[in-house]
């Protein structure tokens, strides 16, 4: 057992059929030695008296909010939660597995640009009762400071017959230098807490890794005289890390109408514009990459050819 | 400790392409590596981030862009001095700064020509012959340093006697490969700011 | 299986001209662009043009700007390369090539052998 | 337009060794290069396109690299099948322009 937060513990149990489970020593944060009394939950039902309680934790039925009392006031209170353990593994029963970039992807972490500013984001399909925690460093042993936001529904989507919601958080390292050269990963911890169940998620990663720049902005259309080909321009998003000639982005270019199948022109870049072929109907999109360090793909940015 | 922005006289700055062709090349080799040792831990997050050149070159801080140098992060420099003259520095107007950088960037080559040449010497033993540094990427090194033409004392190959630890050997190369390439991607990003300057 | 297949090959005269065909199979005739490509004997590639046939949109080489038309006929899933003002170095197998990509050709015909000769 | 060098023009080979071969474009062109294979009295077949992306149905010993100005074609071990002749092609801007071709030879 150990302690999450003030009054609010963690216990770690093996799950399977019929297991021991753990015991739990309970103790009432009070002066008072006499006429101590112990209940669970909203029931009124006597668990158990003096300033301590031993209970068998075996089950959810077992978890809660302990109260102990004396004559009809509280004294204080411990909420236990369970953590399982299922054949040697924690439970991930809370969060949903994104499979992207690989199984047991849990926790989705991206980054703007270099400044030591990050966003992770979840999923899970349970609507109520849900809380989490955050916390970040630099490496695990002597850590540096990483400070994370509070986690937030960022949104909310219909998946077949079920809800899928979406929580993020911000984070940013405390002091960074973006172009410093990273030797230590960021460990991310998530705690989650749905009803009596916890869990723990957590992500590792340079920051170099999780680059996925804004999309290119400002994209303009020159046609070219005499020739179906027209020049594309755009700019390096606002968000990208500065000097642009130091953290240089590179850029694909194409041409293509609404259904992916559909023929296109397609062109790669490290400038700020391109010579690519019109079609009635079609887009240009243009979207971003470090130059250098072969990260994310922005999303696109599109403009109609006509 | 950092490089200015009036440099190099307009035209290709002459260590641009071969900055280009070492991250491409050892780029390669990594990815090489990665497929040739797949039962070997050899992916970034398998590996311990080890940087060789650590304490005793700042190319990062020596050669930061004039316009980090308002963030105090970044400034945790350490003093080391360098040689001062070099080929890449393509007009007069160049200041000890940027040959400080460049320098400093001579001497990473410097560290780790040395490193992957007694490193390949011991792979040549190995009787499984499974992997061997790409000649490219050697010849690449080779070139840079020609091109930013520092004049230093030669580093010694080092020899060792006893008999090479092969797994431990081909470990110490994805090490080695990873923190190369991503010294090569700060080089690249400063020939670039060099070029543009 | 996409397949291109070409004409027959041709002798032609200087200053005549020749219209070699390219008939697809395999996929939707206009979802690809069509381009044609030449080889002289011992001699390295070189792109003459290119056609949508959606639009009949076409871009050809400065090289042969004025001496080249593409073609295509949706109906029977062709295009056409019509040279004209033959010289003896027209000489060469002339290939169709195509691709959803407009820059490059993932699938290249069996070359039409054009030679010109008085 | 721009000019795509080979080199070199003629690569002599033992089989089962492998073979690289290179192409510069005169002027910069990321990674708009696509390489083909071609054997006597056949059209050339596409091997990689963008440089580095590989093609479904190539074998994987066929890899490229590059990008800007220097651009390598490298197969890892030469089986009988692939002595033939190699273009580079560049996509940057029209005119496509090609390659002179290597000649990838028994040795």
């Known amino acids: 057992i150990w302690e999450l937060k003030k009054d609010v513990y963690v216990v770690e149990l093996d799950w399977y059929p019929d297991a021991p489970g753990e015991m739990v020593v309970l103790t009432c944060d009070t002066p008072e030695e006499d006429g101590i009394t112990w209940t669970l939950d909203q029931s009124s039902e006597v668990l158990g008296s003096g300033k301590t309680l031993t209970i068998q934790v075996k089950e959810f039925g077992d978890a809660g909010q302990y109260t102990c009392h004396k004559g009809g006031e509280v004294l204080s209170h411990s909420l236990l939660l369970l953590h399982k353990k299922e054949d040697g593994i924690w439970s991930t029963d809370i969060l949903k597995d994104q499979k992207e970039p690989k199984n047991k992807t849990f926790l989705r972490c991206e980054a703007k640009n270099y400044s030591g500013r990050f966003t992770c984001w979840w999923l899970t399909t349970i609507s109520t009762d849900l809380t989490f925690s955050v916390k970040s460093s630099r490496g695990s042993s002597d850590p540096q400071g990483v400070t994370c936001g509070a986690a937030t529904l960022s949104a909310e989507r219909v998946r077949g017959d079920n809800k899928e919601y979406e929580y993020s958080v911000e984070c940013q390292e405390d002091s960074a230098c973006p172009a410093a050269e990273e030797s230590l990963p960021i460990e991310v911890m998530v705690d989650a807490v749905h009803k009596l169940k916890y869990e723990n998620y957590t992500s590792s990663f340079f920051i170099r890794d999780i680059i996925k720049p804004d999309p290119p902005k400002n994209l303009q259309l020159k046609p070219l005289k005499n020739s179906r080909q027209v020049e594309v321009s755009w700019e390096y998003p606002d968000t990208w890390s500065t000097p642009h000639s130091y953290f240089s982005l590179t850029f694909c270019v194409q041409v293509q109408g609404k259904s992916k199948r559909e023929k296109k022109d397609r062109v790669f870049t490290d400038k700020t514009s391109a010579t690519v072929i019109c079609r009635k109907n079609a887009s240009i999109s243009v979207r971003a990459q470090d130059r250098y360090y072969s990260s994310s793909w922005s999303e696109w940015a599109s403009v109609p050819c006509s | 400790r950092n490089l200015p922005v009036a440099t190099p006289d307009p035209g290709m700055f002459p260590c641009l392409h071969h900055s280009q062709n070492l991250l491409r090349a050892v780029s390669n080799m990594l990815q090489k590596a990665r497929q040739t040792l797949e039962f070997y831990p050899c992916t970034s997050e398998e590996i311990d981030h080890e940087d060789i050149t650590k304490d005793k070159t700042s190319t990062v801080e020596a050669c930061l862009p004039l316009e980090l140098t308002k963030n105090e992060s970044c400034l945790n420099s350490r003093e080391t001095s360098f040689i001062t003259n070099g080929s890449c520095l393509a007009s007069r107007k160049t200041s000890f700064m940027m040959a400080l950088c460049l320098s400093s960037i001579y001497e990473d080559l410097k560290m780790y020509q040395v490193e992957f040449k007694t490193m390949n010497a011991k792979l040549l033993m190995d009787p499984k012959r499974q992997i061997f540094l790409d000649q490219n990427m050697l010849a690449v090194i080779d070139e840079l340093m020609q091109a930013l033409n520092f004049n230093s004392e030669t580093v010694p190959q080092k020899s060792s006697l006893e008999e090479p630890d092969f797994y431990k050997t081909k470990i110490k190369l994805c090490i080695l490969l990873h923190a190369f390439r991503i010294r090569a991607v700060t080089i690249d990003r400063v020939m670039s700011y060099l070029n543009a300057s | 299986q996409v397949q291109l297949v070409q004409s027959g090959a041709e002798v032609k005269k200087p200053g005549s001209s020749v219209k070699v065909s390219c008939k697809a199979s395999?996929?939707?005739?206009?979802?690809?662009?069509l381009h044609w490509v030449r080889q002289a004997p011992g001699q390295g590639l070189e792109w003459m043009g290119w056609?949508?046939?959606?639009?009949?949109?076409?871009e050809y080489a400065p090289k042969f700007q004025g001496r080249v038309t593409i073609t295509a006929d949706e109906s029977t899933s062709t295009a056409y390369m019509e040279l004209s003002s033959l010289r003896s170095e027209d000489t060469a197998v002339y290939y169709c090539?195509?691709?959803?990509?407009?820059?490059?050709?993932?699938?290249i015909g069996q070359g039409t052998l054009v030679t010109v000769s008085s | 337009d721009i000019v795509m060098t080979q080199s070199p023009l003629s690569l002599p080979v033992t089989p089962g060794e492998p073979a690289s071969i290179s192409c510069r474009a005169s002027?910069?062109?990321?990674?708009?290069l696509h390489w083909y294979q071609q054997k006597p009295g056949q059209a050339a077949r596409l091997l990689i396109a963008?440089?580095?992306q590989s093609i479904s149905g190539v074998p994987s010993r066929f890899s490229g690299s590059g990008s800007g100005t220097d651009f390598t074609l490298t197969i890892s071990s030469l089986q009988p099948e692939d002595f033939a002749t190699y273009y580079c092609?560049?996509?940057?801007?029209?005119?496509?322009?090609f390659g002179q071709g290597t000649k990838v030879e028994i040795k």
């Open positions: 090539a195509r691709n959803k990509e407009l820059r490059y050709f993932d699938v």
């Open positions: 395999g996929g939707t005739f206009s979802d690809y662009y």
């Open positions: 056609i949508d046939p959606e639009n009949g949109d076409t």
């Open positions: 002027q910069s062109i990321s990674i708009n």
């Open positions: 963008f440089a580095s």
């Open positions: 092609q560049q996509s940057n801007s029209f005119p496509l322009t």
